[in-house]
């Protein structure tokens, strides 16, 4: 009975996500057969989050809306380890929007999920950000510095990275 009710709960939770994510990839968390963590297929997983590289080129606002429709946000990068994981899936000749913007042009950078902006955990390329007109952040590759962030005009279409919390069932 216990296993049956657990299965019913899992199925009901899976139905919630089915509209946007018809297929999930789940792994057992730890040693307890009861706990599974899932990411939509073909999203990648790192720690407690799932990531999707969107190769369609859109403005920052449209990229954020696109992530939102999938139950995610443009990526918020909290640690160097997280960035190191993300860049494994990026192409060096492309740029990708982050969930970081300065809509007022006052250098008050803000993350889409309201995570406080911490100057000590940022990975700007040297000399960036450098233009008050450029109010959205991308991650891109520069041969001299490898991967880092740059400020650009928000309406210029770029690829993007979506991030959502893992689905626990």
């Amino acid at each position: 009975n216990f296993m049956y009710s657990k299965t019913v709960k899992r199925l009901s939770k899976l139905r919630e996500y089915q509209q946007y994510h018809p297929s999930l990839t789940c792994v057992m968390e730890g040693k307890d057969i009861e706990d599974w963590s899932c990411c939509p297929t073909p999203w990648t997983s790192f720690q407690s989050s799932c990531y999707f590289i969107s190769t369609g080129m859109q403005s920052w606002t449209k990229s954020q809306k696109n992530c939102s429709v999938m139950g995610a946000d443009l990526v918020v990068i909290n640690t160097r380890e997280e960035q190191d994981f993300i860049i494994q899936n990026l192409k060096r000749n492309s740029s990708y929007f982050l969930g970081l913007s300065d809509p007022g042009g006052r250098r008050h950078w803000q993350w889409v999920d309201q995570t406080p902006y911490n100057e000590n955990v940022t990975f700007w390329h040297s000399g960036e950000p450098n233009n008050l007109d450029e109010r959205c952040a991308i991650i891109n590759f520069r041969s001299s510095e490898e991967w880092g962030w740059n400020d650009i005009h928000c309406h210029v279409p770029q690829k993007s990275i979506c991030k959502m919390k893992k689905i626990y069932i």
Partner: antibody, heavy 121, light 111 residues
Framework: EVQLLESGGGLVQPGGSLRLSCAAS????????MSWVRQAPGKGLEWVAT????????YYPDSVKGRFTISRDNSKNTLYLQMNSLRAEDTAVYYC??????????????WGQGTTVTVSS | DIVMTQSPDSLAVSLGERATINCKAS??????????VNWYQQKPGQPPKLLIY???NLESGIPDRFSGSGSGTDFTLTISSLQAEDVAVYYC?????????FGGGTKVEIK
Amino acid sequence: EVQLLESGGGLVQPGGSLRLSCAASGFTFSTYTMSWVRQAPGKGLEWVATINSGGDNTYYPDSVKGRFTISRDNSKNTLYLQMNSLRAEDTAVYYCATYRPYYYGSVLDYWGQGTTVTVSS
Amino acid sequence: DIVMTQSPDSLAVSLGERATINCKASQSVDYDGNSYVNWYQQKPGQPPKLLIYGASNLESGIPDRFSGSGSGTDFTLTISSLQAEDVAVYYCQQSDEDPWTFGGGTKVEIK
């Protein structure tokens, strides 16, 4: 008072080249993103190119990408548009304009009087 | 690309009467409470002039008989009491995503 003065227009044969200039005064040119917009005879407006204040980022629509190059010389307060491989459909009045950000978008708030480019054999 | 469709193509209005111009975007140009649509006025032989930005914000120095409204995909420019100097072509433009695109223009004349 903001002033933008375009020059360099004229008659050119198809396949030819032309360089337009836009001399700016009355504002701190080096801190402004700038754009070119064109208007074919009796037609509407078409965005042609944008360059950021430092000149390191440039943007174009597909219709001119690979043929037109926007650049600037902040020491001379001048914006340029190098136009190569010109076609009859590039015939238009070309305006330079200042760009002002508005949250995630922008406006083109000051425009020059324009310079006329005619591509014809 | 986002297509901006203006209507009508031309409009004849009596002096002192209201003129209304519509602009429809092929997809939403809103984000976080702001609409990325601007309106420009172009008089014969002159460059365009910014009237309204962000769908409803009146540019400095523009008479308050001009107003803008709308959100999502549908936007309107209204001249509450047409003056002789308002004879011009009016263009809407979206700045949400490159390439920036303009409507085809609406010619306003005196009836």
